[in-house]
Every structure is written in structure tokens, then in C-alpha cells.
Interface confidence: low
């Protein structure tokens, strides 16, 4: 070709028109072009319709082209990667109809100040979205709803002050979230949902440590090994986790995960609070963490949580990482989950000291509770493995343009193994949530003293109680299947659906599962 460099690599016909001072698409490019580099030209405006003759085009690099407008017309049915980074776009073009097969979209280092609600509509195949280095202040709540396959999301280096509570809803494949270097001061309750997020970058934000931060604090404690500091040019797999990088802006860079939360309302105080925010005091004994006697009081009204972390009993696991396939009530962080009217919990539940030991992760899913009183472990067929298979190899491709088919700018340099931060010894009370409409209480409000019996096998770990009786004889158990500082989660099951599925979860009583 007279202007561009053409090369054939395997089945790919790659055309490199980088840095040719082009103001438009050069004529007469090979019709079977699969990869087209147009980086560092002076295109200013560009119409995707001009590429319609290139029906095999799978990768298009338009980075550093001084683009102020991208016209989206026609259809490029197999285009999978579009790099628009380092341009001057002030609005994100609606690409869904034009690029139905898009899997990687890089719009980093543009001038985006906002995104419309339907910005990603039609991009159902999208796996990687890079919006780093723009000027975004807020995001529309349902922004990512059209992209359920999303694996990597970079919102780093923007001006974000807040995040919509349900932003990550339904993103079961998300493995890398980059939120560093924004203006975030809190994380809404339930923001992370219940699925595992192996790589989170949250540093460089002015986190405001007050009672509103307790949900985030607990999430950090539970996911300490998954919180990293971004280092340019270093592959996330080679980075060392650093939960202490997430620091309170209002208290001399104190790590958020250690924030004591003194003076914040706790469960049992006046008002309704989210279960996830209350945890027992913990004291450490070498390799173990003891959860001291915990009293959890539930109010005499239907308990509402704006994020639904009530586990289906059949999916509750003792592994510190939550399964990615969970009860439907966990999938929406916006919808509120209210106990059905026929069950109004009003009891005190005591859990005597249970000691958890940190040992290697169980990679097997939890098993459903059998219907007999003697539980027999059996794999749950519909559940995915706890360990995330995807290891992000492209954490932040926007740091540099990516004109060739090689992976854009991840890197790997040996780094020490992640160290587990010591758990905090303070309770984690939470602010009260909006109270739901009170419902009449049931006639009896029993106090149930439970020390959960357990059946532990190498492949599955779960707790079950066979009948609602006081079990005081087993006051201390060592459970060897946990790998992290233990997480004690009050798990109440009040959903009609799950009580249909499990005879032991009768709505007249409730079980506490330490997780």
C-alpha cells in the first residue's frame, strides 16, 4: 500500500497507518484487513461507516488522533476492539448498534464529563471498558446494565465523587475494578454485591471515615487480599495487595479498614441497621482469630436491607470468598429485600466463641443443606468455583496506545506475596438504614441460643442446624477451611423462595451462619 504498512501475521492482515498525518481513511486498503492502526493522525472527526467495506475488521486503533467527534453509522459486525484513547471526545458515542461484537472499548484520556444512561446499550459482549483519565464526576445508575459480561472496568483518574449503589449489579464476571485517583469519599452500602472481586484499586481517594464508611470498611476487611495499589507498567498478578492504601482523608491517612467507628450506632441500638455492618469484636491468637461472644438483636419489625446480603442457606459457604452464583436476592443492590410478612424476626441470638483457623482456600463450592438431619455433602451443580479463573492480563491498557495485537501495557515483575493485614479489634457498627413500614409481630418472640453444629469435609464446608433448639454444648469449634481473617456474617434467611427449598429454614425460626 502506498501510505500504510501491510503485514500478514497468521490469519490476520494487519494494516499500520500510524503517524502518517492522515486526515481521513486512506483509500484502497485491503478488503480483508483485520487489524487497522490509525493512531497518531489528525483525523479530528471520523465516521465508522467508512470502514463498512472491511467486513473482517476485528481491531481498530484510533488513539491519539485529535478526535473530537466519532460518527457512528453503519455496522461493523465483527469489530472486537476499539481504542479511542488519548483523543478529545467530550461525549461517548452510542456504539451499540454499530459495534454489536465489541469486547474491548478504550476511551481513556479523553474529555468525557458525563455519560448518558444508555451509553453502553447494545454492547452486550463488552468485557473490558477503560474510562481512565477523563473528567467524569458522576455515573448514571444503570450504566453497566447492558454489559453483563464485563470483566475489567477502569474509572481511575476521574473526578468521581460518588458511585451509584447498583453500578456493579449483575456483573458476575467482573475481576478488575480500578477506581483509584478519584474524589470518592464513600462507597454506598452493598456496592460490591456478593461476588468475588479479585483486583480492586481504590487508593488516592479522599475517603471520609464516619459512620457511613462502615460497609466499605467491612468489605475491605473481608477482601484485604484483593485490594492493590496501581503501579504503572506492572501486571496486577505481580502486584502486592495493600489494603492499607485505602486511607481516611479526614484522619491523617488512617487506613479505612482499621477505622474504629466509635460512637456509630450498632445493631441493638435504636433504629434499624444493616446486618452486614455489625460484627463482633475480634481478638487474635497467633494464626487464629477468635470471635468473642456476640449478641445480635433484631428489631421487632421486618428487616430491610438495601442490598440483599441475605444468603440462601444452600449457597452459604465457610470460605472467605463468596460464591459468584448466589441467591437472586443478592444480585440487585438497589432493590430492597424485606422479610415476608409472615416472619418477623424478634429474638436475640447468642453465638459463643467460635475460633476460625486460616488455612489454604477451599476451591470447592458450598453444598446445599440436605433435607435429612444428617447432612451429606454433595456438590452443588449450578455453582461456579470460588477461585476466579480470569487473571487479568490487561489491567490498564489505556496508559499507552495499543496499535498492535499484543497485550496493551500490563507487566509483570516479581512482587512479594500478598500479606494479610491483621483484623481490627473494634466492632463495626453502622448507621441506621431507612426504616421499613412496621409489620405486626408474631405472637412469640423466642430467644434462641445457637452454637452451630458443623459438618466439615475437605470439599465442602457448611453449617446447619437440624431443629431450633438451644445447643450450648458445642461452645467452641475450630473450622480449618478459612484462608483470611475470618468473617462472621449474620446470615438470616427470610425469603419464601429459599424456605420452600430448605425444610430447615422454616420462617418461624432463623439460623445464624458464621462465615
Amino acid at each position: 500500500h502506498p501510505i500504510c504498512e501491510v503485514s500478514k501475521v497468521a490469519s490476520h492482515l494487519e494494516v499500520n497507518c500510524d503517524k502518517r498525518n492522515l486526515t481521513a481513511l486512506p483509500p484502497d486498503l485491503p478488503k480483508d484487513t483485520t487489524i487497522l492502526h490509525l493512531s497518531e493522525n489528525l483525523l479530528y472527526t471520523f465516521s465508522l461507516a467508512t470502514l463498512m467495506p472491511y467486513t473482517r475488521l476485528t481491531q481498530l486503533n484510533l488513539d491519539r488522533c485529535e478526535l473530537t467527534k466519532l460518527q457512528v453509522d453503519g455496522t461493523l459486525p465483527v469489530l472486537g476492539t476499539l481504542d479511542l484513547s488519548h483523543n478529545q471526545l467530550q461525549s461517548l458515542p452510542l456504539l451499540g448498534q454499530t459495534l454489536p461484537a465489541l469486547t474491548v472499548l478504550d476511551v481513556s484520556f479523553n474529555r468525557l464529563t458525563s455519560l448518558p444512561l444508555g451509553a453502553l446499550r447494545g454492547l452486550g459482549e463488552l468485557q473490558e471498558l477503560y474510562l481512565k483519565g477523563n473528567e467524569l464526576k458522576t455515573l448514571p445508575p444503570g450504566l453497566l446494565t447492558p454489559t453483563p459480561k464485563l470483566e475489567k472496568l477502569s474509572l481511575a483518574n476521574n473526578n468521581l465523587t460518588e458511585l451509584p449503589a447498583g453500578l456493579l449489579n449483575g456483573l458476575e464476571n467482573l475481576d478488575t475494578l480500578l477506581l483509584q485517583e478519584n474524589s470518592l469519599y464513600t462507597i454506598p452500602k452493598g456496592f460490591f454485591g456478593s461476588h468475588l472481586l479479585p483486583f480492586a484499586f481504590l487508593h488516592g481517594n479522599p475517603w471520609l471515615c464516619n459512620c457511613e464508611i462502615l460497609y466499605f470498611r467491612r468489605w475491605l476487611q473481608d477482601n484485604a487480599e484483593n485490594v492493590y495499589v496501581w503501579k504503572q507498567g506492572v501486571d496486577v498478578k505481580a502486584m502486592t495487595s495493600n489494603v492499607a492504601s485505602v486511607q481516611c482523608d479526614n484522619s491523617d491517612k488512617f487506613p479505612v479498614y482499621k477505622y474504629p467507628g466509635k460512637g456509630c450506632p450498632t445493631l441493638g441500638d435504636e433504629g434499624d441497621t444493616d446486618l452486614y455492618d455489625y460484627y463482633p469484636e475480634e481478638d487474635t491468637e497467633g494464626d487464629k482469630v477468635r470471635a468473642t461472644r456476640t449478641v445480635v438483636k433484631f428489631p421487632t419489625k421486618a428487616h430491610t436491607t438495601p442490598w440483599g446480603l441475605f444468603y440462601s442457606w444452600s449457597t452459604a459457604s465457610l470460605d472467605s470468598q463468596m460464591p459468584s452464583s448466589l441467591h437472586p436476592t443478592q444480585e440487585s443492590t438497589k432493590e430492597q429485600t424485606t422479610f415476608p410478612p409472615r416472619w418477623t424476626p424478634n429474638f436475640t441470638l447468642h453465638m459463643e466463641s467460635i475460633t476460625f483457623s486460616k488455612t489454604p482456600k477451599s476451591t470447592t463450592e458450598p453444598t446445599p443443606s440436605p433435607t435429612t438431619s444428617e447432612p451429606v455433602p454433595e456438590p452443588a451443580p449450578n455453582m461456579t468455583t470460588l477461585e476466579p479463573t480470569p487473571s487479568p492480563t490487561t489491567p490498564e491498557p489505556t496508559s499507552e496506545p495499543a496499535p498492535s495485537p499484543t497485550t496493551p501495557e500490563p507487566t509483570s515483575e516479581p512482587a512479594p506475596s500478598p500479606t494479610t493485614p491483621e483484623p481490627t479489634s473494634e466492632p463495626a457498627p453502622s448507621p441506621t438504614t431507612p426504616e421499613p413500614t412496621p409489620i405486626p409481630t408474631i405472637a412469640t418472640s423466642p430467644t434462641i441460643l445457637v452454637s452451630a453444629t458443623s459438618l466439615i469435609t475437605p470439599k465442602s464446608t457448611f453449617l446447619t442446624t437440624t431443629k431450633p433448639v438451644s445447643l450450648l454444648e458445642s461452645t467452641k469449634k475450630t473450622i480449618p477451611e478459612l484462608d483470611q481473617p475470618p468473617k462472621l456474617r449474620g446470615v438470616l434467611q427470610g425469603h419464601l423462595e429459599s424456605s420452600r427449598n430448605d425444610p430447615f429454614l422454616h420462617p418461624d425460626f432463623c439460623c445464624l451462619l458464621p462465615l
Epitope: 506492572v234 499507552e400 497485550t407 496493551p408
Partner: antibody, heavy 118, light 113 residues
Framework: QVQLVESGGGVVQPGRSLRLSCAAS????????MSWVRQAPGKGLEWVAS???????YYPDSVLGRFTISRDNSKNTLYLQMNSLRAEDTAVYYC????????????WGQGTLVTVSS | DIVMTQSPDSLAVSLGERATINCKSS????????????LAWYQQKPGQPPKLLIY???TRESGVPDRFSGSGSGTDFTLTISSLQAEDVAVYYC?????????FGGGTKLEIK
């Protein structure tokens, strides 16, 4: 540990060409942006070229059109093809690893001297 | 291009004393999005390549002694060696890593008085 070893320097006449190489080890070469920085005798540092992990090259105006940076990830080697050399290109040429778009240089080689003289 | 100007050209300081080197850029190196200044400092000893000391104005590279510190914002920056050691004799360069082409200051030669 990270090591960068330059080679290919020498004495060359003005207008001629020279190709420098930089052998990298101790890190995943293909994943890092790489650069050449030069230092004329007794002078300061001057950035010459960079190439991203994906292969996109960048140059300052002083060498644009004369120098070409390239990389062979299979050989963990960085190259600098220098054409139409001038006397003012005389310098020690350092190969440096950079962290990406931030483009400061965290590891440097020992350098190779290029002398352009008639 | 962003021009980097260092001062002084040379500096003689007694062992154990504080050394201060200044660097001025022709335009701001502050990224308003993340409030970071994109300035790095390097140390070059005779016959050796440069060594990264500090980036983002004040972040010390791993392994760099804490007697080295960086400060400043916008266009004016400072490298401080709190207590000069014999091994600190070198030429020090600032570099902006804010905008291509990446440019260096002219260098400051630090000697022992």
C-alpha cells in the same frame, strides 16, 4: 533483578547509520514501555525515543524521521536504528525502562557511546 | 515543549548538612484530575547511569534512603537531602513526566564542602 545491556555503539561518519541494541532481562520485557535517553559528553540528559509494550513509537522532533525505535519481544531486545547521523548525535545512549504513560524511567542500562565524526 | 530549569548549577555542602536543589518548569506539571505533580528526580554518579530517586514530586523509589525528599507543586520543585553523606556526591536531574516530549533539567552538581 532488572538488567539492561546496550551494545552497538562506536564511531561513525556523519550521514551514516548505526543500530543500537538493548538486551533486557529480569522482568517481563514485553509488558513494559522502553525508551532511549542520551547524554552528550559533559552535558545533560535528552530523551530520544520510547516504544510502548504494544509497539507504538514516540520521538522528539530532534530525531523524528531519522531514528526508529523497535522491539523484539521474543528476544527481549530493544533497538534504535539511527540514520543520517549528525555530529550533535554524539552521546552515550542509555536504554531505560519506563512505567508506561507516566514515562519516568525506573531502570537504566550502563549506556553505549556513539561518536559521529568525520 | 516543557522547559525544565535547575538551580544552582553546582552546590557544595558539608557532610551532615542539608542540601537543596531547585527545579522550575515552564508550565504546570499538576494534573488537576488527580492532584499529582508529574516530576521525577534522578541521581547520576560519575561513570554511572542515572538512578531514579523520586517520582510524582515526592514519592521515593523503593530502596532510596529517606534522607532524600521531594516537594513542590505546579512549576516549582525542590529535592532535599536532609543530611549529606559522602555517597551522595553526584549530579542530580529533574524530569517532567507530564507531557511528551519528556524533558530534563540541566543538572545540579553536588559536591562536599
Amino acid at each position: 533483578q532488572v538488567q539492561l545491556v546496550e551494545s552497538g555503539g562506536g564511531v561513525v561518519q556523519p550521514g551514516r547509520s548505526l543500530r543500537l541494541s538493548c538486551a533486557a532481562s529480569g522482568f517481563t520485557f514485553s509488558s513494559f514501555a522502553m525508551s532511549w535517553v542520551r547524554q552528550a559528553p559533559g552535558k545533560g540528559l535528552e530523551w530520544v525515543a520510547s516504544i510502548t509494550s504494544a509497539g507504538t513509537p514516540y520521538y522528539p522532533d530532534s530525531v523524528l524521521g531519522r531514528f526508529t525505535i523497535s522491539r523484539d519481544n521474543s528476544k527481549n531486545t530493544l533497538y534504535l536504528q539511527m540514520n543520517s547521523l549528525r555530529a550533535e548525535d554524539t552521546a552515550v545512549y542509555y536504554c531505560a525502562r519506563s512505567r508506561g504513560y507516566e514515562d519516568y524511567f525506573d531502570y537504566w542500562g550502563q549506556g553505549t557511546l556513539v561518536t559521529v565524526s568525520s | 515543549d516543557i522547559v525544565m530549569t535547575q538551580s544552582p548549577d553546582s552546590l557544595a555542602v558539608s557532610l551532615g548538612e542539608r542540601a537543596t536543589i531547585n527545579c522550575k518548569s515552564s508550565q504546570s506539571l499538576l494534573n488537576s484530575r488527580n492532584q499529582k505533580n508529574y516530576l521525577a528526580w534522578y541521581q547520576q554518579k560519575p561513570g554511572q547511569p542515572p538512578k531514579l530517586l523520586i517520582y510524582f514530586t515526592s514519592t521515593r523509589e523503593s530502596g532510596v534512603p529517606d534522607r532524600f525528599s521531594g516537594s513542590g507543586s505546579g512549576t516549582d520543585f525542590t529535592l532535599t537531602i536532609s543530611s549529606l553523606q559522602a555517597e551522595d556526591v553526584a549530579v542530580y536531574y529533574c524530569q517532567q513526566h507530564y507531557s511528551s516530549p519528556w524533558t530534563f533539567g540541566g543538572g545540579t552538581k553536588l559536591e562536599i564542602k
